[in-house]
Amino acid sequence: LEETLLNTKLETADLKWVTFPQVDGQWEELSGLDEEQHSVRTYEVCDVQRAPGQAHWLRTGWVPRRGAVHVYATLRFTMLECLSLPRAGRSCKETFTVFYYESDADTATALTPAWMENPYIKVDTVAAEHLTRKRPGAEATGKVNVKTLRLGPLSKAGFYLAFQDQGACMALLSLHLFYKKCAQLTVNLTRFPETVPRELVVPVAGSCVVDAVPAPGPSPSLYCREDGQWAEQPVTGCSCAPGFEAAEGNTKCRACAQGTFKPLSGEGSCQPCPANSHSNTIGSAVCQCRVGYFRARTDPRGAPCTTPPSAPRSVVSRLNGSSLHLEWSAPLESGGREDLTYALRCRECRPGGSCAPCGGDLTFDPGPRDLVEPWVVVRGLRPDFTYTFEVTALNGVSSLATGPVPFEPVNVTTDREVPPAVSDIRVTRSSPSSLSLAWAVPRAPSGAVLDYEVKYHEKGAEGPSSVRFLKTSENRAELRGLKRGASYLVQVRARSEAGYGPFGQEHHSQTQLDESEGWREQLA
């Protein structure tokens, strides 16, 4: 990139540069016509018959250098061929010399600095590549010469450029003074500012473009060369922030459109919002979940939104005394998640009708919550209680939902408690054909014993047809029609309103061999 300090092609008013000495044949400011047929201000000198060693000087106005260390001067000039000038002396030249002088202010006058190589600094002696020539009977022909010179290094606030003619017939058609700078550059989402090179190469720190963040690693830098070009080298750059994607050839970050998101900084483009989510604004790093949908804390920002599951279905209970086996089917709606678990809530109602959460005497196997399989075994149920179990399905977002958790209920009523087994049977009297038995009244928890059932059979006769039953309302019984001298096995169970209790242990009794022994009491 070139930054112009002076361009005479753009000047419309007289340039009014300083000449020295003030004599005839000096540089003269004239109107000219450039390649685009625009009128331009030019300087012409044509004193080809001067005395040897006599110089004509032309000096520009003071030019602020604007931070440039090296300045370039492009000269466009024409020059007449000495051979075409019949009256040209031997001092006719086809070259001229360019100088500069630095100063911190516009302090030069018509006489100072002294018009000589020191204090002026010589840049170059310029020779014409193309000479304008005229041959008799033909038009004059020629071409414009273009020459670019380099001035510097410069250190003061500004400078003057000077031209020394020592016998040429020439016109300075235009002077373009400029310096080179590295243009503002955006690469890999990193902006490098416009930089004026102060040395052969200058490191320049970059900054991230709007809505970009630095990539890991060293901060990005590029080298600005003296010729105003950025040195080609890979740039560890920046990347677009969450909610933004690279655009326009990696030169800017563009906000994700509505309905799209980008969760992380770095490469990659905005993606459509995942299931059950939306973004109503541009530049979304995350899509908001629809009402009733959530992301668990451990879910990635780009994960779909999910909802708690519906209730489990078809709870089946199997009661076995004080233990209960429950099993159910998975919910119809999983909520879009894999982390499905089940939990149970339990209430118990006493026979009198007062209800409360289940007590700690119940045990759940494998547990009351975090069940991964659709079943549980509940132990320690109390008789004649009504239990209500609410089976809920849960997933990773159930805790985020407000409102009631859907459940599938099941009611189970345990049997009332039957009398305990009758075990302390004793024989109060025996004969060859009968046995009189008595036992202690068992403690029935649910009301009094209504009656008893005695079960007996001859020892060794195990078939169902040999078993006989006898009901009695008293805690005694007489077994008649027995075999003489035979052994009998006897069991008793009690009945209350809750039903029969279990038979007690078998009691072993024996009838008398003969009648003479008579009735006698016999202890069990």
Epitope: E28, L30, S31, G32, L33, D34, E35, Q37, T42, E44, C46, V48, T78, M79, L80, S84, L85, P86, R87, T132, K134, P136, G137, A138, E139, A140, V144, C169, M170, A171, L173
Partner: antibody, heavy 126, light 107 residues
């Protein structure tokens, strides 16, 4: 502003010669083209020839070749046009005119004449 | 020498009229053509050079066009001071030539 001042009116006999001068005042002279143009009474403009003083030689219209001589003196910034073997049809106003741009300061040699002398009436009569 | 033919030789027009004068060269002269205006008793005045470049100080109602052999001078809205004789002038050759002139008169 450059001025071109021409010499005064002349009355000449047929067969004689006339030399008209054109003095340029102010600034560069050597690298501009100086043309000579004549205009007979009630007639149009007629280009006779031109000179670029620094080059010395002149270019002439075919019609006047051999009868006209255009010269320039750089030291006095004066151009001259001499016409010989005058005839009555050479009676005309003779103008000198300078080109808009020097030979060095124009990319295209349009030789457009933007400065004109006041004209010199040359009458050829016996 | 290259011959330049102007047409018309004369024309009558009113103030405000659009006037067009043409000039034809006997051979290709690229755009090396100039136009002049001359009023009675005065030296010619340069209007246009290079076929279409307006000389400094000349009103913008004057315009020129053309290249090769056919050229046009146009006055977009004739003013009282524009009644004069107009000449084309070719400078393509070492030997310049003028057209015979076009007189613009008041109708």
């Amino acid at each position: 502003q450059v001025q071109l001042v021409q010499s005064g009116a002349e009355v000449k006999k047929p067969g004689s010669s006339v030399k008209v001068s054109c003095k340029a005042s102010g600034g560069t002279f050597s690298t501009y083209a100086i043309s000579w143009v004549r205009q007979a009474p009630g007639q149009g403009l007629e280009w006779m020839g031109k000179i670029i003083p620094i080059f010395g030689d002149a270019d002439y219209a075919q019609k006047f070749q051999g009868r006209v001589t255009i010269t320039a003196d750089e030291s006095t910034s004066t151009a001259y046009m001499e016409l010989s073997s005058l005839r009555s049809e050479d009676t005309a106003v003779y103008y000198c005119a300078r080109s808009s741009y020097t030979i060095l300061t124009t990319y295209y040699n349009y030789n457009a004449m933007d400065n004109w002398g006041q004209g010199t009436l040359v009458t050829v009569s016996s | 020498d290259i011959q330049m033919t102007q047409s018309p030789s004369s024309l009558s027009a009113s103030v405000g009229d659009r006037v067009t004068i043409t000039c034809r060269a006997s051979q290709n002269i690229n755009n090396f053509l100039n136009w002049y205006q001359q009023k009675p008793g005065k030296a010619p005045k340069l209007l246009i050079y290079g076929s279409s470049i307006l000389q400094s100080g000349v009103p913008s109602r004057f315009s020129g066009s053309g290249s090769g052999t056919d050229f046009t001078l146009t006055i977009s809205s004739l003013q009282p001071e524009d009644f004069a004789v107009y000449y084309c002038h070719q400078v393509s050759d070492t030997s310049d030539t003028f057209g015979q002139g076009t007189k613009v008169e008041i109708k």
